[in-house]
Interface confidence: low
């Protein structure tokens, strides 16, 4: 018995087609993705093949003006229109709190939304009960397939799930649910979830009874053969993991931003064992037409967005590199721009001894969600910035000891190389890392811009000195694992809205050209 699994993950509000780098579409003839194009391909495959499941592995929420304005209603509406069969909760589904998940998505979705390792407690337990499920048994042709969901247990560090949701270890939570499906004689089980490729592989290895893992969160691109676009494969598609009980378990992900539609064909024997698996992500390029009815619906919903944020704020004459491939690995000029804007927004020359009360900025690279292409006449709009900074946070002022900052920079690279969001972009700081050293001892040089000086210059960080730092409220609250900031900050003053800070700076500067200039180095 053959099953076709179509899958998306980390779509991040890319309802409309995008440029090749998943930023705003500039030249429509070269644009990709979007739900109208996705629908065309899905329908094509549904017409051609008998047993098709369309699955999403989480993080539909957050990323463009669509989410800024519609707050998840757009996700429910268009996923319903595409007739998704199931979705796993991603960490970003909690960005507007639990209510921002329940009302627009959980209550409106016409498909099951899954996570086995999220447990509600307190008053939320009854409110949310049944609105998401640990698993769902789906009829597919003459067979049934069990889909069991999972979500990154780091979600409380990455989003806003509140205090009444407990995120359990994925493997520990998944096993009993898979066992339950087995007792119901469901012998074909897909783990659909959002914890990253490393966890996906662990689930394939450790959870007995899981036949296929469909993942997300790490934006992993897998491909067999010659890749069709810029993404470099992290491995073959599907990636085969040998489970502890000797089975070959296919693991898949489909990059991100709706650029690809994952396509996996699985052959099962009569006992539900995987006999074979093959496929590849399908690049949703402009050769695939956008479905007219979905496109018309997009255009109808688009009207509200057009009134929101299309005015030009200023211009860039350089590419603003906000890609995760850059900002989560090295200094990126988008990070520099944002940090410069954050410092500029906090210029308070109140004392002759100090050129300013604060000189330093840190910014988690994972908070930078999109690049901006300069080839659109250099125009920067609020809409562009909303894709870069979609979280609606604030840039806050804190006071920290030097020792806390040192811990923060060690945390920045404690698991370097996994495309995790805690890698810090900086302003008013020069840092040098040695990645050959063990985690926790990788910062070999940390110089900070003086404030009590007439000519600003960089001096070594002093462990016992108290420094003022501008940072996102997300970091001040211990997000991305920066618990030391939350625990050790001496003062915290809430600041201005993030997009507003950057837009004000761009409007003030009129033309910007941020460079990569050696703020972050590796020895």
């Amino acid at each position: 018995w053959e099953l076709t699994i179509l899958h998306t993950n980390d779509v991040h509000s890319r309802l409309e087609q995008t440029s090749e780098d998943s930023s705003k579409c500039v030249n429509a003839s070269r644009c990709m993705g979007g739900v109208a194009r996705l629908f065309t391909k899905v329908q094509q495959i549904r017409r051609a093949e008998p047993n098709v499941l369309l699955l999403d592995a989480g993080d539909q929420y957050q990323g463009t003006i669509w989410f800024t304005v519609y707050k998840g209603a757009e996700v429910a509406h268009f996923m319903n229109a595409l007739r998704y069969d199931a979705m796993a909760l991603g960490n970003h589904e909690f960005d507007n709190g639990v209510e921002g998940l329940i009302e627009p998505l959980l209550k409106e979705a016409k498909f099951p939304i899954l996570s086995a390792n999220i447990k509600a407690k307190g008053p939320l337990a009854s409110q949310i009960s049944g609105l998401y499920l640990p698993y769902k048994v789906l009829p597919v042709g003459d067979e049934v397939v069990g889909i069991v969901g999972y979500t990154s247990k780091e979600t409380p560090f990455l989003s806003n799930p509140g205090t009444n949701l407990v995120f359990e270890d994925e493997i520990t939570a998944l096993q009993p649910e898979v066992d339950k499906l087995k007792t119901l004689n469901v012998n074909k089980i897909i783990a659909l979830g959002h914890s990253g490729f490393e966890m996906d592989k662990l689930i394939a290895q450790k959870v007995r009874g899981v036949d296929v893992v469909v993942g997300g969160h790490s934006n992993t691109f897998l491909y067999t053969g010659n890749p069709p676009s810029k993404e470099v494969p992290a491995g073959k598609y599907p990636f085969i993991v040998t489970s502890d009980d000797g089975r070959k378990v296919p693991v898949v992900q489909a990059y991100a931003f709706g650029k690809y539609l994952g396509y996996l064909k699985i052959e099962f024997d009569e006992r539900g064992n995987v006999i074979s698996s093959h496929g590849n992500p399908i690049l949703l390029n402009s050769s695939i037409p956008e479905d007219p009815s979905i496109k018309a619906d997009i255009n109808k919903w688009r009207i509200k967005l057009d009134n929101y944020s299309t005015q030009e704020l200023g211009k860039t004459i350089v590419y603003l590199d906000g890609s995760s491939q850059s900002c989560r690995f090295r200094e990126c000029n988008m990070g520099n721009l944002i940090c410069d804007a954050m410092i500029n927004n906090n210029l308070r020359h109140t004392d002759e001894m100090f050129w300013n009360h604060v000189s330093m900025c840190i910014l988690n690279g994972g908070g930078i969600r999109s690049p901006i292409d300069e080839r659109n006449n250099g125009t920067i709009t609020w809409e562009n910035l909303a894709a870069v900074l979609p979280f609606g946070g604030t840039f806050d002022l804190v006071q920290l000891k030097g020792s806390t900052l040192k811990k923060a920079f060690e945390h920045s690279v404690h698991r370097y190389g996994q495309s995790t969001g805690e890698f810090l972009q900086v302003g008013g700081i020069h840092v040098v890392y040695d990645l050959s050293r063990k985690p926790g001892d990788r910062v070999v040089k940390l110089d900070v811009l003086c404030t009590k000086c007439r000519v600003p210059s960089y001096d070594p960080l002093k462990m016992d000195e108290v420094y003022k730092v501008i940072l996102p409220n997300f970091l001040a609250n211990g997000g991305d694992g920066f618990q030391m900031i939350k625990d050790e900050l001496l003062r915290h003053d809430s600041g201005d809205q993030d997009i507003n800070v950057v837009s004000t700076y761009i409007s003030k500067m009129k033309v910007i050209y941020p460079a990569v200039e050696g703020r972050i180095k590796f020895s």
């Epitope: 209550k107 009854s126 049944g130 609105l131 499920l133 640990p134 049934v144 339950k180 119901l184 004689n185």
Partner: antibody
Framework: QVQLVQSGAEVKKPGASVKVSCKAS????????LSWVRQATGQGLEWMGE????????YYNEKFKGRVTMTANTSISTAYMELSSLRSEDTAVYYC??????????????WGAGTTVTVSS | DIQMTQSPSSLSASVGDRVTITCKAS??????VAWYQQKPGKAPKLLLY???YRYSGVPSRFSGSGSGTDYTLTISSLQPEDFATYYC?????????FGGGTKLEIK
Amino acid sequence: QVQLVQSGAEVKKPGASVKVSCKASGYTFTSYGLSWVRQATGQGLEWMGEIYPGSGNTYYNEKFKGRVTMTANTSISTAYMELSSLRSEDTAVYYCARYDYLGSSYGFDYWGAGTTVTVSS
Amino acid sequence: DIQMTQSPSSLSASVGDRVTITCKASQDVSTAVAWYQQKPGKAPKLLLYSASYRYSGVPSRFSGSGSGTDYTLTISSLQPEDFATYYCQQHYNTPYTFGGGTKLEIK
């Protein structure tokens, strides 16, 4: 305690429509499914369809498709079943029944007392 | 649709008897079977779900078993209040279907 309180008996003429209500209390209305099951006098049980008030999802028995509409008003925790083009063979007791679809509890755990619908000219 | 064939359609037994009612599905329903008890003029009451799990408050004399297409309800020692009609139901696939019922009468 969980209660499903149904509307009163109805007498309808052939060709007419009937709308039966089912008011839920004692639990979170949007957290469970509600099925509608009917039983003609001296006969067995027949599943008509179900609604998940949390999402508005409806699934109908093909036999009733086109004639049955199931809706829910979450603000008053009430589900409705409307059956149109009534004929004499629709004379039955109509039950709403709660379905706990979270986990493996495959069954209707609470039932309304039933609404008798008589179709007669 | 999945047919649920219940047998017997009626059964006479005495208090203290052990009674078995069977239900055969027209296809594998993966233990997604519930059993209900109904008394005249009343709504059905859930006894067992997922073939063998007793619903809360249901006496231990009621038990269920089965897998695939064949399912059984057993009452180990009939009590006076057990005389009623019993229905099986598959909750595996829509439309959910019921057996024709077994009327359990006093001998």
